[in-house]
Interface confidence: low
């Protein structure tokens, strides 16, 4: 099972009970060796290839259960065929077994008399047959065969009875790994339910973070949702704030500018007329009326109607009416009332911290109170009880195990020398029969008649026949073991072994009323007394192998129902409860009249109605009527040439002072157009649309004051809502999580499972009955080998 | 325009007390904005210290909590930090700034005094 | 409480290239509440970029920056001498209330 999921719970918030860690294996690896196990199980399919006979044994256990059986009825009679039937495969080698054993002795017998009135074989022909020795060949040939077939099996009695040997004395370690298991089950436990009610401090302490921080978490959430509604209209208000700081400079620079240029104007006109005169003056030099100097004082005396300053510079009008509206514009901080208005949107997390104290410390009071409720909770959990009387069964069957461990390997001692003794004896025939090939084969003489033939070859036919003689003496006592370990053998892997490990074992044993007539659940009536609750051996088997917890796999809540007593909703309602009682007053300051009286007399303050085109019109003329340097120029190059003297001189001493004029009077003036320029362009932008501008703001204002009129509650209270929804997402993830492990993870009773595993899987089939499966299958597999390797033999 | 001047002792003996002022000219500390104190440490990092609101209250840095105390003078336009028990780790520039918490600089700094160099 | 990590440490660019520094944060951020500093030796921090990506007063327009979550940058366009400085970033937070900076980038002529 994954972790519960809480739709409010964060993600990360995640609670992971600590991994117990058991010793003993899930599973037991055979190893190479299990390659022969598997070969004796296609072996054991051949034989007995039908389903596990699950109604039968049902019938059979209930016939069993019975106090007298009667044998004549047509239902214990048809029982009895329908388990021939089942063994049939077993029944059959079995009779063959029986045959085996009652008529090798008696052959051997009857050979044995007959061999002593010289009358099967051992005669001695002076003449070969033709066909002698290849007959000879053919015989040897099967023989060695025969032989490699014996030794296989011998091979597998070897293994079998080694692996019974060391399995078992690996089975002393396997009990005490699984019952370490068994007691770490026992001893976590206690543990896993302090680990459980640890972290109620883990959710009381996130939760007592965020109830601290509920100026930040609340409130920061109040104002994220009121901050785009507000914040825009603000900034505009700022913007505009800015605008009528700018227009006042603009417009006090535009006046400053139009009385310096009135000035300069004036001083240029002064300074032109002075020029002029002092010109005219010049041009009376008797010099100007004799050729060719007169037509150069004719050409200065006509450009000096071109010495004139521009008259409508000092005409254009101040803007002191506009300056003065825009003062009185200032006289209202708009800047300082934009910041209050950020100012109380700053200030909401504070005011929620501020008016939240008594609720938060009502939340905290019931989050102590719910801590308590838990620890009584786990206290009456039934695990408990049930593991204590578990713990007893646990101890008892320690004792038991290790009382009678010593026992069981003296046992399997006996069983380790008995089967080398087998395996041994069926060696020793064997041997006698490679021997007496390998001497045959070697001391052959085709020349050599039967009575001048060699001792090596003697000795090979003395050795065959001390063979055969062994053969006739033993085959038919090892027969007998290989039947006898066989019936048993077979029959528990088909009876125990596979139909556990594929469950249909469990099955049989889930049969209602079968282990116990008035129980239709063993299980839940042995140990609840309650026989009608559905609990079975393999959902039991299946739910510990999975590593559930106890409650959950026993189907404790029917005892104890755990979700009742935690009562999550009793618990997240006390906290909703308090949580109602949550109430916050926000006062968010928006401008007020000062402010909008302010806006819309800077609509009203006439910058957009001032004459622009008129103040932009001079700045692009020339203060003077013509260039002054370039006039200064040609002045002095038509003074150069006139010949030197008084008006020579006087002329450049002129051009000079056209020069100076042009730096000290022109350029300052048109440095002051230049800044009249950029200041008529700023008001000409501020200007532009201005009313437009002011009503649009004045609407946002509307708006925003409308919003925080009408929403700022249902924020409010949505919020709220949002914030005690993570306060309980907390507590309801917490619990469900205490429902979750407890029913799932608490008391993982996998160990159990294993334990019945360790006896069954492990410790029956895998180390008893699959070596002693590999014993009859390999010795019987010699012994009956041993008819044909006899016959050939001879 | 606004300025801000910090002032105060170059030099502290451990477990003393640190005190420094920080003049404001150009604007009345109460009205408005946050006034900080942040400290550089001669590894460049920075670190703030704490403010005083334009309405007089506190906000300081956790780590520091126990040991810090910043106050006012509304007549004088001035700011002071008191840290106690200094060690040599609080070697370090300290400045004094001004948060500008509304649109549009969010809890930006604004304007910085030019430092003061304080060595434990 | 969130850290704000930034990368590179010292970073040295040519003139005219384009240089880019990252701000990471441990946790998201507001973008509202991610500004910019610049530091020259001897003198004190600047209000570089304001609210993640506006430019203070008298920043020149090569200056850019951006991000959200929990990363943020700043961009120079095309680097130029006067741009050599330690740059920092900085984000306020809400709970517990805080002041975090960066450790700063120090930015210098290849």
């Known amino acids: 099972g994954g972790q519960p999921s809480s739709t409010d719970a964060p993600k990360a918030w995640n609670y992971e009970l600590p991994a117990t860690n058991y010793e003993t294996q899930d599973s037991h690896k055979a190893g190479p060796i299990g390659i022969l196990f598997e070969l004796v199980h296609i072996f054991l399919y051949v034989v007995q290839p039908r389903d596990f006979p699950e109604d039968t044994l049902r019938k059979f256990l209930q016939k069993a259960y019975e106090s007298k059986i009667d044998y004549d009825k047509p239902e214990t009679v048809i029982l009895g065929l329908k388990i021939v039937y089942y063994e049939a495969g077993i029944i059959l080698c079995c009779v063959l077994g029986l045959l085996f054993i009652i008529l090798m002795p008696l052959v051997g017998y009857f050979f044995c008399m007959c061999r002593c009135c010289n009358k099967c074989g051992g005669e001695m022909h002076q003449r070969q047959k033709e066909n002698g020795p290849f007959l000879r060949k053919c015989f040897a040939i099967s023989l060695l065969v025969i032989c490699i077939i014996i030794s296989i099996g011998i091979f597998y009695g070897f293994v079998a009875n080694h692996q019974v040997r060391t399995r078992i004395k690996r089975s002393r370690k396997l009990a005490d790994s699984n019952f370490k298991d068994l007691r770490t089950l026992l001893n976590e436990t206690p543990e896993q339910i302090k680990y459980i009610l640890a972290q109620y401090n883990t959710t009381k302490d996130k939760a007592f973070t965020d109830l601290n921080s509920i100026n930040s978490v609340l409130g920061g959430g109040i104002l994220d949702r009121l901050r785009p509604n507000i914040i825009p209209v603000l900034d505009e208000i700022k913007s505009m704030a800015t605008a009528i700081k700018e227009t006042k400079e603009a417009l006090e620079n535009m006046n400053s500018t139009l009385k310096s240029l009135h000035q300069q104007s004036t001083q240029l006109s002064s300074s032109l007329t002075s020029v002029k005169t002092s010109l005219r003056s010049s041009l009376n030099d008797p010099l100007c009326l004799v050729h060719p100097s007169s037509e150069t004082c004719n050409s200065i005396r006509l450009s000096l109607s071109q010495l004139n300053s521009n008259p409508e510079l000092r005409q254009l009008p101040p803007v002191d009416a506009e300056l003065d509206n825009v003062n009185n514009v200032l006289r209202t901080d708009l800047d300082g009332l934009v910041q209050q208005g950020y100012q109380s949107l700053n200030d909401i997390p504070d005011r929620v911290q501020r008016q939240t104290t008594t609720v938060v410390a009502g939340i905290k009071r019931v989050l102590n109170s719910i801590g308590s409720d838990i620890d009584n909770v786990t206290q009456r959990l039934p695990i408990q009880d049930i593991l204590s009387a578990f713990s007893v069964y646990v101890n008892n069957t320690e004792s038991y195990i290790h009382r009678n461990l010593p026992t069981l390997e003296e046992y399997d001692s006996y069983w380790w020398l008995g089967g080398l003794v087998i395996c041994s004896l069926l060696t020793l025939i064997v041997i006698f029969y490679y021997l007496g090939l390998l001497c045959g084969v070697c001391g052959y003489d085709r020349h050599a008649t039967p009575t001048t033939r060699g001792c090596v070859s003697n000795t090979g036919g003395v050795f065959l026949m001390v063979g055969v003689g062994l053969s006739f003496l033993f085959c038919w006592i090892l027969m007998i073991i290989v039947v006898l370990t066989f019936v048993f053998g077979a029959n528990v892997e088909k009876l125990i072994c596979e139909p556990y490990t594929s469950k249909e074992l469990f099955r049989v044993l889930d049969t209602p009323y079968l282990l116990n007539e008035d129980w239709e659940y063993y299980l839940s009536g042995k140990l609840f007394n309650k026989s009608k609750m559905k609990l079975t051996f393999e959902q039991v088997y299946s739910d510990c192998k999975k590593n559930r917890g106890t409650y959950g796999t026993l189907h404790l809540q029917n005892s104890f129902n755990i979700s009742e007593h935690l009562n999550i909703n009793e618990h997240t309602g006390s906290i909703s409860s308090e949580l109602e009682s949550l109430k916050v007053n926000l006062n968010i300051f928006l401008l007020g009249a000062a402010g909008r009286k302010n806006l819309q007399d800077f609509a009203a303050c006439g910058i957009d109605r001032m004459n622009y085109d008129s103040y932009l019109a001079q700045t692009g003329k020339s203060p003077a009527g013509v260039n002054l340097l370039s006039f200064a120029y040609d002045l002095e190059a038509k003074a150069n040439s006139l010949p030197p003297g008084n008006l020579r001189n006087s002329l450049k001493r002129d051009a000079q002072t056209i020069k100076t004029i042009h730096q000290q009077r022109v350029l300052p003036i048109e440095q002051s157009l230049s800044t009249l320029y950029q200041s008529v362009k700023i008001l000409q932008r501020t200007g532009n649309g201005l009313l437009e501008r002011v009503t649009r703001i004045l609407a946002s204002l509307d708006f925003a004051q409308n919003f925080i009129t009408n929403n700022t509650s249902s924020v409010i209270i949505e919020e709220t809502k949002k914030y005690g929804r993570t306060i309980i997402g907390y507590f309801e993830h917490y619990l469900q999580w205490i429902e979750f492990s407890i029913s799932e993870k608490v008391a993982s009773c996998k160990p159990v499972a294993t334990a019945l595993d360790t006896a069954v899987d492990v410790f029956l089939c895998s180390y008893i009955i699959d070596p002693l499966n590999l014993f009859w299958f390999g010795i019987g597999k010699a012994t009956v080998f041993l008819l044909p390797a006899l016959i050939f033999a001879v | 325009d606004v300025q801000l001047q910090e002032s105060g002792p170059g030099l502290v003996k451990p477990s003393q007390s640190l005190s420094l002022t920080c003049s404001v000219t150009g604007y009345s500390i109460t009205s408005g904005y946050y006034w900080s104190w942040i400290r550089q440490f001669p590894g460049n990092k920075l670190e703030w210290m704490g403010y005083i609101s334009y309405d007089g209250s506190n906000n300081y840095n956790p780590s520091l909590k126990n040991r810090i105390s910043i106050t006012r003078d509304t007549s004088k336009n001035q700011i002071f930090l008191k840290l106690n028990s200094v060690t040599t780790e609080d070697t370090a520039t300290y400045y004094c700034?001004?948060?500008?918490?509304?649109?549009?600089?969010?809890?930006?700094?604004?304007?910085w005094g030019q430092g003061i160099s304080v060595t434990v | 409480q969130i850290v704000l990590t930034q990368s590179p440490a010292i970073m040295s660019a040519s003139l005219g290239e384009r240089v880019t520094m990252t701000c990471t944060a441990s946790?998201?951020?507001?973008?509202?509440?991610l500004h910019w500093y610049r530091q020259k030796p001897g003198s004190s921090p600047k209000l570089w970029i304001y609210s993640t990506s506006n430019l203070a007063s008298g920043v020149p327009a090569r200056f850019s920056g951006s991000g959200s979550g929990t990363s943020y940058s700043l961009t120079i366009s095309s680097m130029e001498a006067e741009d050599a400085a330690t740059y920092y970033c900085h984000q306020y937070h809400r709970s517990p209330y805080m002041y975090m900076f960066g450790g700063g980038t120090k930015l210098e002529i290849k």
């Open positions: 946790s998201s951020v507001s973008s509202f509440y």
């Open positions: 700034t001004r948060v500008y918490f509304g649109h549009p600089y969010y809890y930006g700094m604004d304007y």
